[in-house]
C-alpha cells in the first residue's frame, strides 16, 4: 500500500523543528478535522432547526452511519489495539460516501467541507500505514456507495438537512472515540 504523506522513512524536517511521530501526526490530523466539523455544524445549525431536535427524534433514521460498539475493542473496558485500529479505518472508509454527500450541502463553507473530506483521506492513509492487519479492513463496495449517494441526494429538503446534521454529529462522535482510543495505543 502507498506510504502516507509524512511517513516516508526518507522524510526529514527543517533543523528548527523535529518531525512529529506517527501518533502525534494522526492526533493532530483528527483534531484538525474535528475543528472543521465544528465550523460545518455552525453553518448547518444557523440554516435549520435540526440542532434543537431531540436525539430521540433524530435517532429514527435509516442511515447506517458507523458507530463504535463494545465489540470493536476501542473502549477502555476490553480495549484491543489491533481490532480497534481495524474498526477506526473501516469506519472512516464507510464515512467517505457520507462526506461525499456533504460536498454540495454548504454555501459559505464549501471549502471547509472539501478540506474535511480530503484531510480525512490523508488520515486514512496515516492509519493504514500504522495498521499491521490490512487484510481485515473491508472497503465499501463502490456500486453500493453510488446508489446510496443517489438515494440521499433525492430526499426532500427537510430530510437532506436532517441527513447533513446526522452525518456531522455521528462523524464527530466517531472521531472523538477514535482519538481517545488512539491515545491509548
Amino acid at each position: 500500500a502507498p506510504v502516507p504523506p509524512g511517513e516516508d522513512s526518507k522524510d526529514v524536517a527543517a533543523p528548527h523543528r523535529q518531525p512529529l511521530t506517527s501518533s502525534e501526526r494522526i492526533d493532530k490530523q483528527i483534531r484538525y478535522i474535528l475543528d472543521g466539523i465544528s465550523a460545518l455544524r455552525k453553518e448547518t445549525c444557523n440554516k435549520s432547526n435540526m440542532c434543537e431536535s431531540s436525539k430521540e427524534a433524530l435517532a429514527e433514521n435509516n442511515l447506517n452511519l458507523p458507530k463504535m460498539a463494545e465489540k470493536d475493542g476501542c473502549f477502555q473496558s476490553g480495549f484491543n489495539e489491533e481490532t480497534c485500529l481495524v474498526k477506526i479505518i473501516t469506519g472512516l472508509l464507510e464515512f467517505e460516501v457520507y462526506l461525499e454527500y456533504l460536498q454540495n450541502r454548504f454555501e459559505s463553507s464549501e471549502e471547509q467541507a472539501r478540506a474535511v473530506q480530503m484531510s480525512t483521506k490523508v488520515l486514512i492513509q496515516f492509519l493504514q500505514k500504522k495498521a499491521k492487519n490490512l487484510d481485515a479492513i473491508t472497503t465499501p463496495d463502490p456500486t453500493t456507495n453510488a446508489s446510496l449517494l443517489t438515494k440521499l441526494q433525492a430526499q426532500n429538503q427537510w430530510l437532506q438537512d436532517m441527513t447533513t446534521h446526522l452525518i456531522l454529529r455521528s462523524f464527530k462522535e466517531f472521531l472523538q472515540s477514535s482519538l481517545r482510543a488512539l491515545r491509548q495505543m
Epitope: 493532530k28 478540506a115 483521506k121 490523508v122
Partner: antibody, heavy 119, light 107 residues
C-alpha cells in the same frame, strides 16, 4: 477569495543567501499546509517541501534537505523559504501553494518568484 | 520515490477536439492523483483532485479517471483558453512527485 502573493524576482550572487516570501489572504493561514514547488526554465515541477503554519512542523523532500529552510510568520500570514549557498542549479521559478486543509493537493498557487543565480 | 510518466510531452489538437492526456505511476497510488494546468505566463491552477473531483471554478469539460497506476485527463471540447501545459501529481507518498508535463499545441 484565496490569494497567495509572492515576493518579486531576485538576482543573487552564487553563495549568497536567498529568502523568498508568500503572503496569504482570504483564508485561515494556520489551517492548511503550505507547500513550495520549484520549476527550472523549460522544465517540470518539483516538490520542495511543506510546512504546517500552526506549529511549524516541516516536511522536506530529501533532495532539498541541505538547501531549503521553510518558516512562517503567523502574525503577517506569510510563509518564507530560504535557501543556502545558491548555485546556477537553483535558478528557477519558485511557487508557494496551499492545500485543502492538511491534504496533498496544491489547491491554490502563488504567481511564482523568479530567482536567477549569476555572478 | 514514485515516478510519474506522461508519455506525450506535446500533443497537437484542434479547437473543439476531445483531448485525452495520460499519466502513469511507477507503483500503485490508488486514487491519490491530481491534475494541474500551467498557462504560458506561468500561472498554475488545480483542475482535478483525487483522480476525478473537479476543483471549484473549473469548467465541466474537464474530467479525470483512472486508479492504481494509470490515469487520464480528458478535455471534451477544446477551447482556446485550454492551450497550456498539463501536469499530473501523486499524493500517495512523500516526496510528492509530478509528471514531466504534456503541452497542448494547436494543429
Amino acid at each position: 477569495q484565496v490569494q497567495l502573493q509572492q515576493s518579486g524576482p531576485q538576482l543573487v550572487r552564487p553563495g549568497a543567501s536567498v529568502k523568498i516570501s508568500c503572503k496569504a489572504s482570504g483564508y485561515s493561514f494556520n489551517r492548511s499546509w503550505m507547500h513550495w514547488v520549484k520549476q527550472r526554465p523549460g522544465q517540470g515541477l518539483e516538490w520542495i517541501g511543506m510546512i504546517d503554519p500552526s506549529d511549524t512542523e516541516t516536511r522536506l523532500n530529501q533532495k532539498f534537505k541541505d538547501k531549503a529552510t521553510l518558516t512562517v510568520d503567523e502574525s503577517s500570514s506569510t510563509a518564507h523559504m530560504q535557501f543556502k549557498r545558491p548555485t546556477s542549479e537553483d535558478s528557477a521559478v519558485y511557487y508557494c501553494a496551499r492545500a485543502y486543509g492538511f491534504s496533498i493537493e496544491f489547491a491554490y498557487w502563488g504567481q511564482g518568484t523568479l530567482v536567477t543565480v549569476s555572478a | 520515490d514514485i515516478q510519474m510518466s506522461q508519455t506525450s510531452s506535446s500533443l497537437p489538437a484542434s479547437l473543439g477536439d476531445r483531448v485525452t492526456i495520460s499519466c502513469k505511476a511507477s507503483q500503485d497510488i490508488r486514487s491519490y492523483l491530481n491534475w494541474y494546468q500551467q498557462k504560458p505566463d506561468g500561472t498554475v491552477k488545480l483542475l482535478i483532485y483525487y483522480t476525478s473531483r473537479l476543483h471549484s471554478g473549473v469548467p465541466s469539460r474537464f474530467s479525470g479517471s483512472g486508479s492504481g497506476t494509470d490515469f487520464s485527463l480528458t478535455i471534451s471540447n477544446l477551447e482556446q483558453e485550454d492551450i497550456a501545459t498539463y501536469f499530473c501529481q501523486q499524493g500517495a507518498t512523500l516526496p510528492l512527485t509530478f509528471g514531466a508535463g504534456t503541452k497542448l499545441e494547436l494543429k
